[in-house]
Amino acid sequence: GWVWNQFFVPEEMNTTSHHIGQLRSDLDNGNNSFQYKLLGAGAGSTFIIDERTGDIYAIQKLDREERSLYILRAQVIDIATGRAVEPESEFVIKVSDINDNEPKFLDEPYEAIVPEMSPEGTLVIQVTASDADDPSSGNNARLLYSLLQGQPYFSVEPTTGVIRISSKMDRELQDEYWVIIQAKDMIGQPGALSGTTSVLIKLSDVNDNKPIFKESLYRLTVSESAPTGTSIGTIMAYDNDIGENAEMDYSIEEDDSQTFDIITNHETQEGIVILKKKVDFEHQNHYGIRAKVKNHHVPEQLMKYHTEASTTFIKIQVEDVDEPPLFLLPYYVFEVFEETPQGSFVGVVSATDPDNRKSPIRYSITRSKVFNINDNGTITTSNSLDREISAWYNLSITATEKYNIEQISSIPLYVQVLNINDHAPEFSQYYETYVCENAGSGQVIQTISAVDRDESIEEHHFYFNLSVEDTNNSSFTIIDNQDNTAVILTNRTGFNLQEEPVFYISILIADNGIPSLTSTNTLTIHVCDCGDSGSTQTCQYQELVLSMGFKTE
């Protein structure tokens, strides 16, 4: 049978020919009668055999990491007969490892983020090196990790490559660290190969700094003319943290928050001082407020860094503005009777300069030919007033500072013209009526009514009478209905068209004013032939036709 031991060849042998071992048949008595042959993978190119002795040699440098085993076949032939002495057999040549590969970090680049102020022992990252050498061959691929750079803040576990924090770090002092890790094979023994990697460790921010005002005093100014909501200046606190941890909120201490407010601009982290209530230089020309600042987000466990809020004092100076005159009232309403003579007193308006210099004021009434105003604000009539033409005047009074005519104020002035009884009542329309020749006594021929242009405090009441002449010698009479109307009645039987075709009746109408006014109004009454029907309609129709120039049969 075949006789051999297991074959090993060390990798990376530089000799031109390296003896591996011997293949032989136990029938071989050493007299060179047998011929040994090598077949299969690498036969002739990588491995050769001494045909006489069966000694096997490697004739090429081998790399275990490239190929670690070769399966070959061996034959032994009797030279004399040319026949196989043993059956063809497979055998294996294993390439044995040497420590020719350094550890390599395959997952580079390494980068880790860890919160600042993390306690000792906090895991940062694990780095892993791999070694192409045979892990089953001694310590060729057994690695030890060590820290070349990064003390005293970091440490590495020698066998796992786990990097941990060994000392608290403050991001505000240094926000990133380069750590250099070395991996050595042979568990660090002499002859070990090594590889290194760099790890960038970034510290993430925690809210361990409160915002602090860099200035203990801010001086701001505000114009007294500034409207509410006006931004009058900014204040700024600084927070060494970043991002969300540097977001802050400004506020005013409660006692000082009547006139001013502070809002936070979350983009710039500035405090904007705004006017909450209008200021008046003449009333108060300076203010002092205390502002405070706090972080927007503070986790409970970090409250120890935020016990007392930083404060600053803000002095605000009010700037004087030349303000227009100020009227005592927002508007004025005066009353004056109609028909009062020119120059009659209407009322007094008053405006003052709110500024400290107290400029004299000049007044004027815009667009009015009816009223005058003097420098004292006294308003008088410049024309006689007639309520029946205009009962109200809507005017505008302007006050102008004498020393600065650009400072003007205007307010409304309403003048009501009060009524006096200066109009007598009169017919509400022109009355012309008809009476038939054959009309009987007491026949109603017209109802009349009156109007009065005056305004009545109570209801108007009119009194109707015939004039003295008509009362004494009248074919007609009047009855007052007591409702501001009256009726005209015939006072006799029968009228004669030829003798007296028209009657003109004078009617007196008096009002209930004080003093009472009376007017005389003429009622025209036509006499007409009404026919048998006695209808005034017919009479009206006939008269109408006649008046139009038509002849009737």
Partner: antibody, heavy 120, light 108 residues
């Protein structure tokens, strides 16, 4: 898992050099124990091994093509390449790249292949 | 150079039948160095068997390989519709690596 992808021109003029690249993804070309191989298949015919390379640069070629073949590796790009010079119409084939287990010699996995036509 | 001869060139069978494919080497090949591949039209070959008899990952157990020396066999115990393809053997024993000419298994 490891995947391979061939790339290169689909048409090459006669007498010119055919150049293909195989990009390896899902694993490192620098892993020990593997060869990175090129195989071709003439239309309607069988498979022909061209050669392979170890990532450290050692090459093994089919003697029938050795004079015209160069296989190279770029570990930084995780790629290996084939150059076949002085091509003729007989080099028209689908070219595959594949990973070879160095100890036992089987091909797995393979790229999907790219057809290269040699024509003027 | 080791020449691998595959037979038959074409095998016409019905689904469910048994397929036996032969690969003969021109000289002895270590069984550790013989592999079988399946190739479907328009696709790359796929490893089925390595070391003459070991199934690759994900290969159904209806595929089996055997043989040594110069004679190797691939058996498909019960043909499924997706098994109709071309099958190649390949050796790594002696350089250059070589493939057989292939056996086409087609539907009868």
């Amino acid at each position: 898992q490891v995947q391979l992808q061939e790339s290169g021109p689909g048409l090459v003029r006669p007498s010119q050099t055919l150049s293909l690249t195989c990009t390896v993804s899902g694993g490192s070309i620098s892993s020990g124990g593997y060869y990175w191989s090129w195989i071709r298949q003439h239309p309607g015919k069988g498979l022909e091994w061209i050669g392979y390379i170890y990532y450290r640069g050692r090459t093994y070629y089919n003697p029938s093509l050795k004079s015209r073949v160069t296989i190279s590796v770029d570990t930084s790009k995780n790629q290996f390449s084939l150059k076949l010079s002085s091509v003729t119409a007989a080099d028209t084939a689908v070219y595959y790249c594949a990973r070879v287990y160095s100890n036992y010699g089987w091909f797995d996995p393979w790229g999907q292949g790219t057809l290269v036509t040699v024509s003027s | 150079e080791i020449v691998l001869t595959q037979s038959p060139g074409t095998l016409s069978l019905s689904p469910g039948e048994r397929a036996t494919l032969s690969c003969r080497a021109s000289q002895s090949v270590s069984s550790s160095y013989l592999a079988w591949y399946q190739q479907k039209p328009g696709q790359a070959p796929r490893l089925l068997i390595y070391g003459a008899s070991s199934r690759a990952t994900g290969i159904p157990d209806r595929f089996s390989g055997s043989g040594s020396g110069t004679d190797f066999t691939l058996t498909i115990s019960r043909l499924e519709p997706e098994d109709f393809a071309v099958y190649y053997c390949q050796q790594y024993d002696t350089s250059p690596l070589t493939f057989g000419g292939g056996t086409k298994v087609e539907i009868k």
